[in-house]
C-alpha cells in the first residue's frame, strides 16, 4: 500500500501540490527504498511516495509514530 | 545552473587520475550522476552513475574494474576516477545528469595518457 | 537497449528539411535525446524527453516520436547546423547511443 503523503522529494514536496508526473525511468528501480518512484515533471527530477510506514527523501527511514500507532490499535 | 568539471590532464601510463565535477544551480542528491566518455573521432560511451545521496554506483561492465566514482554533497561534487591508466583512457570525459525537460552537461575534461 | 541511426552520413544542401531518426531495441517510452556535436566541441543537447527543445536551441529543431521510432528534424538547414547527431536512450542503464550522423554540404 502506498500512502501519497508525504510524496518525498528534496526538499519535501507537498502531494497536493504535485498534479503533474510521470513514471521513473526503469534505470531509477532503485531510487525509492520502501515506495514507489515518480518523476515530476515541474521540478524535472525524480521522487518517492513512500508506502505505508516509511518517511524521508527515499522512504528510506521508519515512521516510528506509524509503528507507535499501529502497535496500539492491535491492543 | 550548470556543471564545471576541472582542467585537462596529462599524465604517465600505470599512473591514477581523479576529476571533478561541480554542480551549481541545483542539488546533486536530487538524481543520479553519470559519466561518459569520447575518445578522439569517436562516438560517446556511458561510464557509470552514482547515487550521491547513498553512494551507490553502477558501471558499464568493461569499467567496473578501472572506474571509481565517488560524490561529495558537501560541495555538491561528483568525481570520476581512474587507476592504471592506458593509452586507451585518453579521451574526453563528461559528467552529466539528464531530466525529462532538461539535461546537464559539463564542459568536459580531457584526459591524456602519454609517456 | 541499442540504438540505431541508420545512416551514419547525410548529403544535404542548405535550406533542405533534414530528417534524422533513430530507432531503440526495446521500447523507452520517450526517455530519449538528441545532440548536435561539431569537431572538438563538447555535444550540445538539443532535446530532451524526445520532444522537449532545451532553451537557446532553434525553433527549426524538432523531435518526435512513434513507438520505437524517435527522429529529429530541422525544417530548413542553416551552415552552422552542419555536425554530428548523435541520439541517446536513458530510460535504462547502461545508457546507450546511436552511432551518430553526420551532415555533410553537397
Known amino acids: 500500500e502506498n500512502s501519497t503523503s508525504p510524496l518525498s522529494a528534496d526538499p519535501p514536496v507537498a502531494a497536493a501540490v504535485v498534479s503533474h508526473f510521470n513514471d521513473c525511468p526503469d534505470s531509477h528501480t532503485q531510487f525509492c527504498f520502501h515506495g514507489t518512484c515518480r518523476f515530476l515533471v515541474q521540478e524535472d527530477k525524480p521522487a518517492c511516495v513512500c508506502a505505508s510506514g516509511y518517511v524521508g527523501a527515499r522512504c528510506e527511514h521508519a515512521d516510528l509514530l506509524a509503528v507507535v500507532a499501529a502497535s496500539q490499535k492491535k491492543q | 545552473v550548470q556543471l564545471q568539471q576541472s582542467g585537462a590532464e596529462l599524465v604517465r601510463p600505470g599512473a591514477s587520475v581523479k576529476l571533478s565535477c561541480t554542480a551549481s544551480?541545483?542539488?546533486?542528491?536530487?538524481?543520479?550522476m553519470h559519466w561518459v566518455k569520447q575518445r578522439p573521432e569517436q562516438g560517446l560511451e556511458w561510464i557509470g552513475r552514482?547515487?550521491?545521496?547513498?553512494?551507490?554506483?553502477k558501471y558499464a561492465p568493461k569499467f567496473q574494474d578501472k572506474a571509481t566514482i565517488t560524490a561529495d554533497t558537501s560541495s555538491n561534487t561528483a568525481y570520476l576516477q581512474f587507476s592504471s591508466l592506458t593509452s586507451e583512457d585518453t579521451a574526453v570525459y563528461y559528467c552529466?545528469?539528464?531530466?525529462?525537460?532538461?539535461?546537464?552537461w559539463g564542459q568536459g575534461t580531457t584526459l591524456t595518457v602519454s609517456s | 537497449i541499442q540504438m540505431t541511426q541508420s545512416s551514419s552520413s547525410l548529403s544535404v544542401s542548405l535550406g533542405d528539411r533534414v530528417t534524422i531518426t533513430c530507432k531503440a531495441s526495446?521500447?523507452?517510452?520517450?526517455?530519449l535525446a538528441w545532440y548536435q556535436q561539431k569537431p572538438g566541441n563538447a555535444p550540445r543537447l538539443l532535446i530532451s524527453?524526445?520532444?522537449n527543445l532545451k532553451t537557446g536551441v532553434p525553433s527549426r529543431f524538432s523531435g518526435s516520436a512513434s513507438g520505437k521510432d524517435y527522429t529529429l528534424s530541422i525544417t530548413s538547414l542553416q551552415t552552422e547546423d552542419v555536425a554530428t547527431y548523435y541520439c541517446?536512450?536513458?530510460?535504462?542503464?547502461?545508457?546507450?547511443f546511436g552511432g551518430g550522423t553526420k551532415l555533410e554540404i553537397k
Open positions: 541517446q536512450q536513458y530510460w535504462g542503464t547502461p545508457w546507450t
Open positions: 524527453g524526445a520532444t
Open positions: 552529466t545528469r539528464m531530466g525529462l525537460r532538461r539535461g546537464y
Open positions: 526495446e521500447h523507452i517510452n520517450s526517455w
Open positions: 544551480g541545483f542539488n546533486i542528491k536530487d538524481d543520479y
Open positions: 552514482i547515487d550521491p545521496a547513498n553512494g551507490h554506483t
